[in-house]
Protein backbone atom coordinates (compact mmCIF):
# COMPACT_ATOMS: atom_id res chain seq x y z
CA UNK A 1 0.00 0.00 0.00
CA UNK A 2 1.45 3.40 0.84
CA UNK A 3 0.36 5.27 -2.06
CA UNK A 4 -2.68 5.32 -0.48
CA UNK A 5 -1.90 8.61 1.11
CA UNK A 6 -0.73 10.52 -1.76
CA UNK A 7 -3.73 9.70 -3.58
CA UNK A 8 -6.39 10.19 -0.84
CA UNK A 9 -4.43 13.78 -0.59
CA UNK A 10 -5.03 14.69 -4.10
CA UNK A 11 -8.11 13.88 -4.58
CA UNK A 12 -9.42 16.00 -1.63
CA UNK A 13 -7.15 18.61 -2.91
CA UNK A 14 -8.61 18.43 -6.39
CA UNK A 15 -12.05 19.35 -4.77
CA UNK A 16 -13.64 22.92 -5.47
CA UNK A 17 -14.43 24.52 -1.07
CA UNK A 18 -17.44 23.38 -1.97
CA UNK A 19 -17.06 19.73 -2.96
CA UNK A 20 -15.03 19.64 0.11
CA UNK A 21 -17.32 21.00 2.39
CA UNK A 22 -20.16 18.77 1.14
CA UNK A 23 -17.43 15.96 0.95
CA UNK A 24 -17.18 16.24 4.74
CA UNK A 25 -20.81 16.39 5.53
CA UNK A 26 -21.29 13.16 3.94
CA UNK A 27 -18.51 11.76 6.03
CA UNK A 28 -20.30 12.33 9.19
CA UNK A 29 -23.10 10.26 8.34
CA UNK A 30 -21.32 7.91 5.51
CA UNK A 31 -22.18 4.11 7.09
CA UNK A 32 -18.91 2.69 8.55
CA UNK A 33 -17.58 -0.58 8.92
CA UNK A 34 -17.82 -2.12 12.22
CA UNK A 35 -15.21 -1.17 15.09
CA UNK A 36 -14.48 1.72 13.38
CA UNK A 37 -14.85 5.47 14.99
CA UNK A 38 -16.41 8.35 13.52
CA UNK A 39 -13.92 11.69 13.40
CA UNK A 40 -15.68 14.20 15.55
CA UNK A 41 -17.84 16.33 13.54
CA UNK A 42 -16.26 20.13 15.48
CA UNK A 43 -12.68 19.16 13.99
CA UNK A 44 -13.65 17.97 10.50
CA UNK A 45 -15.24 20.93 9.31
CA UNK A 46 -12.35 22.60 10.50
CA UNK A 47 -9.93 21.20 8.34
CA UNK A 48 -8.53 21.38 5.26
CA UNK A 49 -7.63 18.96 3.04
CA UNK A 50 -4.07 18.15 4.16
CA UNK A 51 -5.50 17.60 7.74
CA UNK A 52 -8.47 15.65 6.42
CA UNK A 53 -6.33 13.21 4.50
CA UNK A 54 -4.08 12.97 7.77
CA UNK A 55 -7.10 12.64 9.71
CA UNK A 56 -8.32 9.87 7.66
CA UNK A 57 -5.17 7.92 7.40
CA UNK A 58 -5.10 7.88 11.36
CA UNK A 59 -8.75 7.36 12.10
CA UNK A 60 -8.89 4.45 9.47
CA UNK A 61 -5.64 3.54 8.19
CA UNK A 62 -4.46 3.74 4.28
CA UNK A 63 -6.33 0.79 2.98
CA UNK A 64 -10.12 1.60 4.21
CA UNK A 65 -9.65 5.35 4.31
CA UNK A 66 -8.91 4.89 0.65
CA UNK A 67 -12.08 2.71 0.27
CA UNK A 68 -13.99 5.25 2.44
CA UNK A 69 -13.08 8.23 0.50
CA UNK A 70 -13.47 6.85 -2.83
CA UNK A 71 -17.54 5.39 -1.13
CA UNK A 72 -18.18 9.21 -0.43
CA UNK A 73 -16.58 10.41 -3.89
CA UNK A 74 -18.88 7.93 -5.54
CA UNK A 75 -22.23 8.94 -3.32
CA UNK A 76 -21.56 13.04 -4.37
CA UNK A 77 -21.52 11.63 -8.42
CA UNK A 78 -17.71 11.62 -8.74
CA UNK A 79 -16.92 8.40 -9.96
CA UNK A 80 -14.58 9.19 -12.56
CA UNK A 81 -12.71 10.68 -9.33
CA UNK A 82 -13.51 7.80 -6.82
CA UNK A 83 -11.95 5.60 -9.52
CA UNK A 84 -8.95 7.48 -10.13
CA UNK A 85 -8.54 7.06 -6.24
CA UNK A 86 -8.85 3.02 -5.86
CA UNK A 87 -6.59 2.51 -9.13
CA UNK A 88 -4.20 4.70 -7.48
CA UNK A 89 -4.53 2.96 -4.29
CA UNK A 90 -4.31 -0.93 -5.75
CA UNK A 91 -1.18 -0.60 -7.89
CA UNK A 92 2.36 -0.35 -7.24
CA UNK A 93 4.05 3.69 -8.29
CA UNK A 94 4.90 2.23 -12.48
CA UNK A 95 2.72 -0.72 -12.41
CA UNK A 96 -0.25 -1.42 -14.58
CA UNK A 97 -3.10 -1.15 -12.31
CA UNK A 98 -4.07 -4.52 -10.76
CA UNK A 99 -7.49 -4.07 -10.97
CA UNK A 100 -9.83 -3.02 -8.05
CA UNK A 101 -9.52 -6.18 -5.09
CA UNK A 102 -11.94 -7.16 -2.86
CA UNK A 103 -12.29 -4.87 0.04
CA UNK A 104 -9.93 -5.52 2.60
CA UNK A 105 -10.93 -7.01 5.27
CA UNK A 106 -14.28 -7.90 4.02
CA UNK A 107 -14.24 -11.63 5.03
CA UNK A 108 -13.40 -10.34 8.83
CA UNK A 109 -15.09 -11.18 11.24
CA UNK A 110 -17.13 -7.83 12.99
CA UNK A 111 -15.60 -5.70 15.64
CA UNK A 112 -12.58 -8.07 15.55
CA UNK A 113 -9.45 -6.00 14.78
CA UNK A 114 -6.89 -7.20 11.67
CA UNK A 115 -4.05 -7.94 14.77
CA UNK A 116 -5.82 -10.25 16.59
CA UNK A 117 -7.91 -11.95 13.07
CA UNK A 118 -4.19 -12.63 12.07
CA UNK A 119 -2.49 -12.90 15.29
CA UNK A 120 -1.04 -16.56 14.09
CA UNK A 121 0.40 -15.39 11.09
CA UNK A 122 2.09 -12.74 12.27
CA UNK A 123 3.94 -14.46 15.58
CA UNK A 124 4.94 -16.71 12.14
CA UNK A 125 6.14 -14.49 10.25
CA UNK A 126 7.17 -10.67 11.53
CA UNK A 127 10.90 -10.56 11.48
CA UNK A 128 11.35 -6.91 12.29
CA UNK A 129 9.93 -6.97 15.74
CA UNK A 130 12.50 -4.22 16.87
CA UNK A 131 11.38 -1.93 14.80
CA UNK A 132 7.92 -2.33 15.71
CA UNK A 133 9.13 -1.80 19.11
CA UNK A 134 10.51 1.73 18.37
CA UNK A 135 7.45 2.88 16.61
CA UNK A 136 4.98 1.45 19.53
CA UNK A 137 7.77 2.88 22.73
CA UNK A 138 6.23 5.74 24.73
CA UNK A 139 2.80 5.30 22.73
CA UNK A 140 1.18 1.97 23.39
CA UNK A 141 4.43 0.31 25.44
CA UNK A 142 5.91 1.49 28.62
CA UNK A 143 9.27 0.92 29.24
CA UNK A 144 9.07 -2.52 31.23
CA UNK A 145 7.25 -4.09 28.27
CA UNK A 146 9.02 -3.39 26.02
CA UNK A 147 12.11 -4.28 27.82
CA UNK A 148 10.36 -7.50 28.21
CA UNK A 149 9.50 -7.85 24.75
CA UNK A 150 13.54 -7.13 23.49
CA UNK A 151 14.67 -9.65 25.43
CA UNK A 152 12.73 -12.72 24.47
CA UNK A 153 15.29 -14.57 22.01
CA UNK A 154 13.81 -15.31 19.11
CA UNK A 155 11.19 -12.96 16.78
CA UNK A 156 8.39 -15.63 17.39
CA UNK A 157 8.70 -15.00 21.07
CA UNK A 158 9.17 -11.51 20.85
CA UNK A 159 5.92 -11.19 19.03
CA UNK A 160 4.07 -13.92 21.50
CA UNK A 161 5.01 -11.53 23.98
CA UNK A 162 4.12 -8.59 22.41
CA UNK A 163 0.75 -10.08 22.09
CA UNK A 164 0.21 -10.37 25.43
CA UNK A 165 -0.01 -6.85 26.10
CA UNK A 166 -2.82 -6.47 23.48
CA UNK A 167 -5.78 -7.80 25.37
CA UNK A 168 -5.12 -4.29 27.41
CA UNK A 169 -5.27 -2.12 24.11
CA UNK A 170 -8.12 -0.30 22.33
CA UNK A 171 -8.66 0.02 18.76
CA UNK A 172 -6.43 2.82 18.50
CA UNK A 173 -3.35 1.57 20.06
CA UNK A 174 -4.19 -1.41 17.54
CA UNK A 175 -4.29 0.34 14.54
CA UNK A 176 -0.40 1.54 15.80
CA UNK A 177 0.54 -1.71 15.35
CA UNK A 178 -0.88 -2.21 12.14
CA UNK A 179 -0.01 1.11 10.65
CA UNK A 180 4.28 -0.12 11.79
CA UNK A 181 3.44 -3.24 10.63
CA UNK A 182 2.52 -1.49 7.03
CA UNK A 183 5.58 0.23 7.17
CA UNK A 184 8.12 -2.25 8.08
CA UNK A 185 6.74 -5.35 6.17
CA UNK A 186 4.01 -3.62 3.42
CA UNK A 187 4.32 -6.67 1.68
CA UNK A 188 3.36 -9.38 5.01
CA UNK A 189 -0.07 -7.32 5.51
CA UNK A 190 -1.04 -7.22 1.74
CA UNK A 191 -0.90 -10.81 1.74
CA UNK A 192 -2.67 -11.24 4.79
CA UNK A 193 -5.70 -8.63 4.01
CA UNK A 194 -5.76 -10.57 0.54
CA UNK A 195 -6.19 -14.15 2.55
CA UNK B 1 0.96 5.74 -16.21
CA UNK B 2 1.66 9.16 -16.32
CA UNK B 3 3.82 10.82 -19.25
CA UNK B 4 5.26 14.57 -18.77
CA UNK B 5 6.44 16.33 -21.68
CA UNK B 6 8.28 19.77 -20.97
CA UNK B 7 8.93 22.78 -23.42
CA UNK B 8 12.35 22.96 -24.40
CA UNK B 9 15.03 24.87 -23.94
CA UNK B 10 14.01 28.57 -22.78
CA UNK B 11 16.15 32.30 -23.08
CA UNK B 12 15.04 35.38 -21.77
CA UNK B 13 16.10 38.77 -20.75
CA UNK B 14 16.47 40.14 -17.09
CA UNK B 15 13.28 41.62 -16.44
CA UNK B 16 11.45 39.59 -18.69
CA UNK B 17 8.52 36.75 -17.28
CA UNK B 18 8.30 33.30 -18.91
CA UNK B 19 5.75 30.85 -19.02
CA UNK B 20 7.12 27.09 -18.86
CA UNK B 21 4.41 24.11 -20.03
CA UNK B 22 4.34 20.83 -18.46
CA UNK B 23 1.67 18.59 -20.69
CA UNK B 24 0.53 15.57 -18.99
CA UNK B 25 -0.42 12.26 -20.38
CA UNK B 26 -1.77 8.81 -19.74
CA UNK B 27 -3.92 9.32 -16.92
CA UNK B 28 -7.02 11.86 -16.16
CA UNK B 29 -5.51 15.04 -15.38
CA UNK B 30 -7.61 16.15 -12.75
CA UNK B 31 -6.67 13.42 -10.51
CA UNK B 32 -3.78 14.38 -9.31
CA UNK B 33 -1.14 17.02 -8.70
CA UNK B 34 1.55 18.83 -10.50
CA UNK B 35 4.86 19.61 -8.77
CA UNK B 36 7.43 22.25 -10.17
CA UNK B 37 10.55 21.95 -8.92
CA UNK B 38 13.66 24.13 -9.83
CA UNK B 39 17.16 23.15 -10.07
CA UNK B 40 20.37 25.15 -10.49
CA UNK B 41 23.86 23.48 -11.81
CA UNK B 42 25.19 21.56 -9.08
CA UNK B 43 23.05 22.49 -6.84
CA UNK B 44 19.68 20.74 -5.46
CA UNK B 45 16.04 20.46 -5.52
CA UNK B 46 13.89 23.33 -4.83
CA UNK B 47 10.23 22.58 -4.13
CA UNK B 48 8.43 25.53 -6.01
CA UNK B 49 4.73 24.56 -5.48
CA UNK B 50 1.74 22.27 -6.30
CA UNK B 51 -1.62 22.82 -8.29
CA UNK B 52 -4.05 20.66 -7.91
CA UNK B 53 -5.81 21.11 -11.43
CA UNK B 54 -9.59 20.41 -10.82
CA UNK B 55 -9.72 22.90 -7.94
CA UNK B 56 -6.64 25.12 -8.89
CA UNK B 57 -5.73 24.84 -5.37
CA UNK B 58 -1.98 26.15 -5.37
CA UNK B 59 0.39 25.66 -2.66
CA UNK B 60 4.05 27.74 -2.97
CA UNK B 61 7.02 27.71 -0.88
CA UNK B 62 7.10 31.60 0.43
CA UNK B 63 10.19 32.41 -1.09
CA UNK B 64 8.50 31.56 -4.58
CA UNK B 65 5.62 33.87 -3.82
CA UNK B 66 5.79 36.78 -5.94
CA UNK B 67 7.95 35.01 -8.47
CA UNK B 68 6.07 31.97 -9.47
CA UNK B 69 2.54 31.70 -10.51
CA UNK B 70 1.26 28.08 -11.39
CA UNK B 71 -1.85 28.11 -13.86
CA UNK B 72 -3.49 24.32 -15.53
CA UNK B 73 -5.08 23.98 -18.54
CA UNK B 74 -7.80 21.21 -18.19
CA UNK B 75 -9.12 21.63 -21.59
CA UNK B 76 -5.00 20.48 -23.02
CA UNK B 77 -3.93 18.58 -20.13
CA UNK B 78 -1.03 21.20 -19.43
CA UNK B 79 0.22 22.71 -16.60
CA UNK B 80 2.23 26.15 -16.64
CA UNK B 81 4.58 27.94 -14.34
CA UNK B 82 5.18 31.70 -15.01
CA UNK B 83 8.43 33.01 -13.72
CA UNK B 84 8.16 37.07 -13.09
CA UNK B 85 10.96 39.88 -13.11
CA UNK B 86 13.93 37.47 -14.13
CA UNK B 87 17.43 37.45 -13.13
CA UNK B 88 20.25 35.21 -13.48
CA UNK B 89 19.35 33.70 -10.34
CA UNK B 90 16.54 32.17 -12.03
CA UNK B 91 18.44 30.36 -14.36
CA UNK B 92 18.00 26.87 -14.14
CA UNK B 93 16.27 23.49 -14.89
CA UNK B 94 12.53 23.45 -13.88
CA UNK B 95 11.07 20.13 -13.64
CA UNK B 96 7.30 19.59 -13.29
CA UNK B 97 6.09 15.94 -11.08
CA UNK B 98 3.21 13.88 -10.65
CA UNK B 99 3.55 12.18 -7.45
CA UNK B 100 5.74 9.38 -9.07
CA UNK B 101 6.67 10.84 -11.96
CA UNK B 102 8.91 13.63 -13.24
CA UNK B 103 9.26 15.47 -16.43
CA UNK B 104 12.84 16.08 -18.40
CA UNK B 105 12.83 19.58 -17.40
CA UNK B 106 13.15 23.05 -18.94
CA UNK B 107 16.53 24.89 -18.98
CA UNK B 108 15.96 28.43 -18.55
CA UNK B 109 19.20 30.98 -18.99
CA UNK B 110 18.14 34.57 -18.24
CA UNK B 111 20.95 36.32 -19.95
CA UNK B 112 21.61 39.85 -21.20
CA UNK C 1 7.92 25.29 7.11
CA UNK C 2 9.68 21.81 7.82
CA UNK C 3 13.96 21.80 7.20
CA UNK C 4 15.53 18.85 6.43
CA UNK C 5 18.97 17.90 6.85
CA UNK C 6 20.73 15.37 5.35
CA UNK C 7 23.54 13.81 6.25
CA UNK C 8 26.45 13.06 5.05
CA UNK C 9 26.71 15.83 2.05
CA UNK C 10 28.98 13.24 0.22
CA UNK C 11 30.33 9.99 0.73
CA UNK C 12 32.06 7.32 -1.23
CA UNK C 13 31.66 3.61 -1.05
CA UNK C 14 33.28 0.63 -1.75
CA UNK C 15 31.20 -2.18 -3.53
CA UNK C 16 29.68 -4.53 -1.14
CA UNK C 17 29.72 -2.10 1.52
CA UNK C 18 26.43 -1.05 3.45
CA UNK C 19 25.88 2.28 3.10
CA UNK C 20 23.38 4.31 5.23
CA UNK C 21 22.22 8.42 4.59
CA UNK C 22 20.12 10.04 7.26
CA UNK C 23 17.22 12.65 6.71
CA UNK C 24 16.65 14.61 9.73
CA UNK C 25 13.43 17.17 10.01
CA UNK C 26 12.90 20.03 11.70
CA UNK C 27 9.45 19.16 13.34
CA UNK C 28 7.55 15.52 12.91
CA UNK C 29 6.37 14.19 9.65
CA UNK C 30 4.36 10.92 9.31
CA UNK C 31 6.23 9.92 6.07
CA UNK C 32 9.49 10.46 4.40
CA UNK C 33 10.32 10.16 0.61
CA UNK C 34 13.61 9.65 -1.35
CA UNK C 35 14.52 10.43 -4.76
CA UNK C 36 17.59 9.17 -7.11
CA UNK C 37 19.30 11.50 -9.00
CA UNK C 38 22.31 11.16 -11.62
CA UNK C 39 24.22 14.05 -13.37
CA UNK C 40 22.17 15.38 -16.64
CA UNK C 41 18.54 13.24 -15.90
CA UNK C 42 15.36 13.74 -13.75
CA UNK C 43 15.04 12.79 -10.05
CA UNK C 44 13.66 9.53 -9.88
CA UNK C 45 11.08 8.28 -7.46
CA UNK C 46 13.03 5.93 -5.32
CA UNK C 47 11.14 4.93 -1.78
CA UNK C 48 7.90 6.41 -0.74
CA UNK C 49 5.95 6.42 2.10
CA UNK C 50 9.36 5.80 4.26
CA UNK C 51 9.54 2.21 3.42
CA UNK C 52 7.88 0.95 0.91
CA UNK C 53 10.29 0.85 -2.42
CA UNK C 54 9.38 2.17 -5.78
CA UNK C 55 8.87 0.41 -9.31
CA UNK C 56 12.30 -1.30 -10.45
CA UNK C 57 13.84 -0.52 -7.11
CA UNK C 58 16.66 -3.35 -6.07
CA UNK C 59 15.72 -5.11 -3.36
CA UNK C 60 19.26 -4.28 -1.75
CA UNK C 61 17.67 -0.64 -0.87
CA UNK C 62 15.57 -0.12 1.88
CA UNK C 63 13.99 3.20 3.82
CA UNK C 64 13.17 3.32 7.60
CA UNK C 65 11.99 5.85 10.28
CA UNK C 66 9.42 8.23 12.34
CA UNK C 67 8.95 11.24 13.53
CA UNK C 68 11.65 13.75 13.13
CA UNK C 69 14.47 10.81 11.97
CA UNK C 70 14.32 8.51 8.77
CA UNK C 71 17.27 6.92 6.65
CA UNK C 72 17.97 5.35 3.49
CA UNK C 73 20.12 2.23 3.29
CA UNK C 74 21.50 0.16 0.67
CA UNK C 75 22.73 -3.22 1.99
CA UNK C 76 25.38 -3.55 -0.51
CA UNK C 77 26.39 -0.44 -2.56
CA UNK C 78 27.26 -1.32 -6.00
CA UNK C 79 28.30 0.86 -8.78
CA UNK C 80 24.92 1.79 -10.50
CA UNK C 81 24.08 3.48 -6.80
CA UNK C 82 26.49 5.96 -7.54
CA UNK C 83 24.46 9.20 -7.64
CA UNK C 84 22.71 12.13 -5.56
CA UNK C 85 19.62 10.92 -3.28
CA UNK C 86 17.20 13.42 -2.01
CA UNK C 87 14.91 13.32 0.86
CA UNK C 88 11.21 14.93 0.59
CA UNK C 89 8.59 15.40 3.11
CA UNK C 90 4.67 15.69 2.46
CA UNK C 91 3.27 16.17 5.41
CA UNK C 92 3.49 20.07 5.50
CA UNK C 93 2.95 22.64 2.68
CA UNK C 94 6.12 24.23 1.65
CA UNK C 95 6.94 19.98 0.65
CA UNK C 96 10.49 20.81 1.44
CA UNK C 97 13.82 18.55 -0.04
CA UNK C 98 16.16 17.82 1.79
CA UNK C 99 19.80 19.72 0.49
CA UNK C 100 21.18 16.10 -1.14
CA UNK C 101 23.76 13.47 -0.21
CA UNK C 102 26.08 12.72 -3.17
CA UNK C 103 27.30 8.96 -3.03
CA UNK C 104 30.20 8.03 -4.58
CA UNK C 105 31.83 4.59 -5.50
CA UNK C 106 35.38 4.31 -4.63
Known amino acids: MGRARDAILDALENLTAEELKKFKLKLLSVPLREGYGRIPRGALLSMDALDLTDKLVSFYLETYGAELTANVLRDMGLQEMAGQLQAATHQGSGAAPAGIQAPPQSAAKPGLHFIDQHRAALIARVTNVEWLLDALYGKVLTDEQYQAVRAEPTNPSKMRKLFSFTPAWNWTCKDLLLQALRESQSYLVEDLERS | QVQLQQSGVELARPGASVKLSCKAS????????ITWVKQRTGQGLEWIGV????????YYDEKFKGKATLTADKSSSTAYIELRSLTSEDSAVYFC?????WGQGTTLTVSS | QIVLTQSPAIMSASPGEKVTITCSASSSVSYMYWFQQKPGTSPKFWIY???NLASGVPARFSGSGSGTSYSLTISRMEAEDAATYYC?????????FGSGTKLEIK
Open chain 2, 26 to 33: GSTFTSYS
Open chain 2, 97 to 101: ATRDY
Open chain 3, 49 to 51: STS
Open chain 3, 88 to 96: QQRSNYPFT
Open chain 2, 51 to 58: IYPRSDNT
